[in-house]
C-alpha cells in the first residue's frame, strides 16, 4: 500500500501540525534513538506536536486544524484517513485555547489477541494534565476487505467502520476491532481519531496484517523440578488456540546466600534445563511466548513462580 502506513513493531513519532507552521518530521525506528525500546515487547507510537520558534503556540491559536502524520525520510507525504462522510479528512477546525503547552503525546500499542478474534489498540495519554481536565474520546475507524465482493486495494470512500474505544480506566483507551477468522491474513486498514477539549487529532491511515501481529496469551502451567542428574528443569505449556509454533523467553534469577545470578534464555521447546544449581537457593522464573517462524509480539510474562532447592541435593535422588 502506498497510501497507508504499515505498522511494524517499532516506535513511531506522530507529529500534529497546525497551519502555517514549519515542522521537523522524523521517524524513530527501534534502535535509532534513546528510549525507543519497550520492555514488554510492544511498539509505541508517540503523538507530539512540534512547532518552530516563530512564536506559534497552542494558546495563541483560536481555531486550528491539526494534521497528524507519521514521517519517514523516504516519504514526506501523509495519507490522511478519509471520513466516511463525503470523503472529508478527519481534521477539523477546532478551538485550541485549552492547550497551554505544546506537549500532547500518546502511546499507541496494537496487537491481535491470542485467541485470534480481537485486534486491540491501547491509546495512552502522556499529556496527563490536559486529559485530566478535559475528557477525551477515542474512535478507531477500520476497514477489512469485504467478504462478499472483490475489494480494491485502496478502500472506497465510506467503507470504514467505527468502534467506540473504552476510555474508562487509567487515562488509557481500549479499542477493539473484531476480526473474522477468514480475514486474519487480509490487510486491516485503520486510523485513530482522538478528541479532547474540542481539539481533534487524526492519525494517518495505517495498515497491518492481523496474523502478523499476534500477541499470544502467556504460557501456562509453569513448574520446576530437580532432575535425576541434579539439574533444574523448568517446564510450561503452550497457550491454547495459537495456530503456529512459538519461541519462548525464559528469565530466571537465582538467589543464594553467596550469589545472586540472573539469566535470560530463548528456546523453542516448552522446557529448559538449568545446570550448576546451588543447594538451598531460590529460583524465581517467568516465561513468555512469541511466534517462532514469523513476525509477532511477545506475550505478557507468566506469573512468576519460585522454587527453593533443598539444602542438600542427593545424587541420585533419595
Amino acid at each position: 500500500f502506498n497510501l497507508s502506513y504499515p505498522i511494524t513493531p517499532w516506535r513511531f513519532k506522530l507529529s500534529c501540525m497546525p497551519p502555517n507552521s514549519t515542522y521537523d518530521y522524523f521517524l524513530l525506528p527501534a534502535g535509532l534513538s534513546k528510549n525507543t525500546s519497550n520492555s514488554n515487547g510492544h511498539y509505541e507510537t508517540a503523538v507530539e506536536p512540534k512547532f518552530n520558534s516563530s512564536g506559534t503556540h497552542f494558546s495563541n491559536l483560536s481555531k486550528t486544524t491539526f494534521h497528524c502524520c507519521f514521517r519517514s525520510e523516504q516519504d514526506r507525504n501523509c495519507s490522511l484517513c478519509a471520513d466516511n462522510i463525503e470523503g472529508k479528512t478527519f481534521v477539523s477546525t477546532v478551538n485550541s485555547l485549552v492547550f497551554q503547552q505544546i506537549d500532547a503525546n500518546w502511546n499507541i500499542q496494537c496487537w491481535l489477541k491470542g485467541d485470534l478474534k480481537l485486534f486491540i489498540c491501547y491509546v495512552e495519554s502522556l499529556f496527563k494534565n490536559l486529559f485530566r481536565n478535559y475528557n477525551y474520546k477515542v474512535h478507531l475507524l477500520y476497514v477489512l476487505p469485504e467478504v462478499l465482493e472483490d475489494s480494491p486495494l485502496v478502500p472506497q470512500k465510506g467503507s470504514f467502520q467505527m468502534v467506540h474505544c473504552n476510555c474508562s480506566v487509567h487515562e488509557c483507551c481500549e479499542c477493539l476491532v473484531p476480526v473474522p477468522t477468514a480475514k486474519l491474513n487480509d490487510t486491516l486498514l485503520m486510523c485513530l481519531k482522538i478528541t479532547s477539549g474540542g481539539v481533534i487529532f487524526q492519525s494517518p491511515l495505517m495498515s497491518v496484517q492481523p496474523i502478523n501481529m499476534v500477541k499470544p496469551d502467556p504460557p501456562l502451567g509453569l513448574h520446576m523440578e530437580i532432575t535425576d542428574d541434579g539439574n533444574l528443569k523448568i517446564s510450561w505449556s503452550s497457550p491454547p488456540l495459537v495456530p503456529f509454533p512459538l519461541q519462548y523467553q525464559v528469565k530466571y534469577s537465582e538467589n543464594s546466600t553467596t550469589v545472586i545470578r540472573e539469566a535470560d534464555k530463548i528456546v523453542s521447546a516448552t522446557s529448559l534445563l538449568v545446570d550448576s544449581i546451588l543447594p538451598g537457593s531460590s529460583y524465581e522464573v517467568q516465561v513468555r511466548g512469541k511466534r517462532l517462524d514469523g513476525p509477532g509480539i511477545w506475550s505478557d510474562w507468566s506469573t512468576p513462580r519460585v522454587f527453593t532447592t533443598q539444602d542438600v541435593i542427593y545424587f541420585p535422588p533419595k
Partner: antibody
C-alpha cells in the same frame, strides 16, 4: 436445536433488582458475542448491553450504565443480565440475541421475557 | 450516536403488492445495514444483512439495496405471512447498535 431461551422476567417495584438468564443450545456459545435487546410495550427495539465471547469485554447503553451488569458462563452456556435500581421506563420485553462477528448483525434471538417495573 | 429513521411508520398493502420501506442514517454507514422482521409476540428475525445479502432461509421476494445513508427493503410480491413490523439496524458504529423506529405493514 439451535436456540436461546430467556427466563427471570416478572413484576418488580421501582428501585428493586431482577436477574434475567438466557440459556443457549445447539451452537458453540463460547465463540459468540451476545446482546441483550429490549422492547418497551408498543415501541421499537433498543440495545441494552453486549458481552464479547470470552466475557472480558462488556458495553452498555447509556441509560443502564451503572445499574445493569451483563455476564456469561461459557461452561454452562448461560448469559445473564443483573438489573439493579430498576425504573418504570425499564419495563420491556428483554431478548437475548447472538451476534454475527463478521457483519455485526443479530442472527439468532430468544423469544423474550417480560419485565414490568411498577409500584 | 447514529440515528436511523424509517419511513413510512406504517403502511397498508394487499397480497401480491410490491412494497418498499426506506431507512435513512444520520451519517454515512457504507453498507453496514441490516433488516429484521417482527411479528406480534415474537422475536425479531434477520432478513437482510450488509444492506443486500439475503439471510439463509429467507424467501427471495425480500431484497435490500442502498449504500451510504439511504437504504430500501423491497418485498416484490406480498404474501399473507409478510404482514409484520420491519426494523433496520446499523452496524457501522459499534458496539452500540441502533435500530430504526420500525415500519408496520398492515393488510389493506
Amino acid at each position: 436445536q439451535v436456540q436461546l431461551v430467556e427466563s427471570g422476567g416478572g413484576v418488580v417495584q421501582p428501585g428493586k433488582s431482577l436477574r434475567l438468564s438466557c440459556v443457549a443450545s445447539g451452537f458453540t456459545f463460547s465463540s459468540d458475542a451476545m446482546y441483550w435487546v429490549r422492547q418497551a410495550p408498543g415501541k421499537g427495539l433498543e440495545w441494552v448491553a453486549v458481552i464479547y465471547y470470552d466475557g472480558n469485554y462488556q458495553y452498555y447503553e447509556d441509560s443502564v450504565k451503572g445499574r445493569f451488569t451483563i455476564s456469561r458462563d461459557n461452561s454452562q452456556n448461560t448469559l445473564d443480565l443483573q438489573m439493579n435500581s430498576l425504573r418504570v421506563d425499564d419495563t420491556a420485553v428483554y431478548f437475548c440475541a447472538r451476534l454475527n462477528w463478521d457483519y455485526w448483525y443479530l442472527d439468532l434471538w430468544g423469544r423474550g421475557t417480560l419485565v414490568t417495573v411498577s409500584s | 450516536d447514529i440515528q436511523m429513521t424509517q419511513s413510512p411508520s406504517s403502511l397498508s398493502a394487499s397480497v401480491g403488492d410490491r412494497v418498499t420501506i426506506t431507512c435513512r442514517a444520520s451519517q454515512s454507514i457504507s453498507s453496514y445495514l441490516n433488516w429484521y422482521q417482527q411479528k406480534p409476540g415474537k422475536a425479531p428475525k434477520l432478513l437482510i444483512y450488509a444492506a443486500s445479502s439475503l439471510q439463509s432461509g429467507v424467501p427471495s421476494r425480500f431484497s435490500g439495496s442502498g449504500s451510504g445513508t439511504d437504504f430500501t427493503l423491497t418485498i416484490s410480491s406480498l404474501q399473507p405471512e409478510d404482514f409484520a413490523t420491519y426494523y433496520c439496524q446499523q452496524s457501522y458504529s459499534t458496539p452500540p447498535i441502533t435500530f430504526g423506529q420500525g415500519t408496520r405493514l398492515e393488510i389493506k
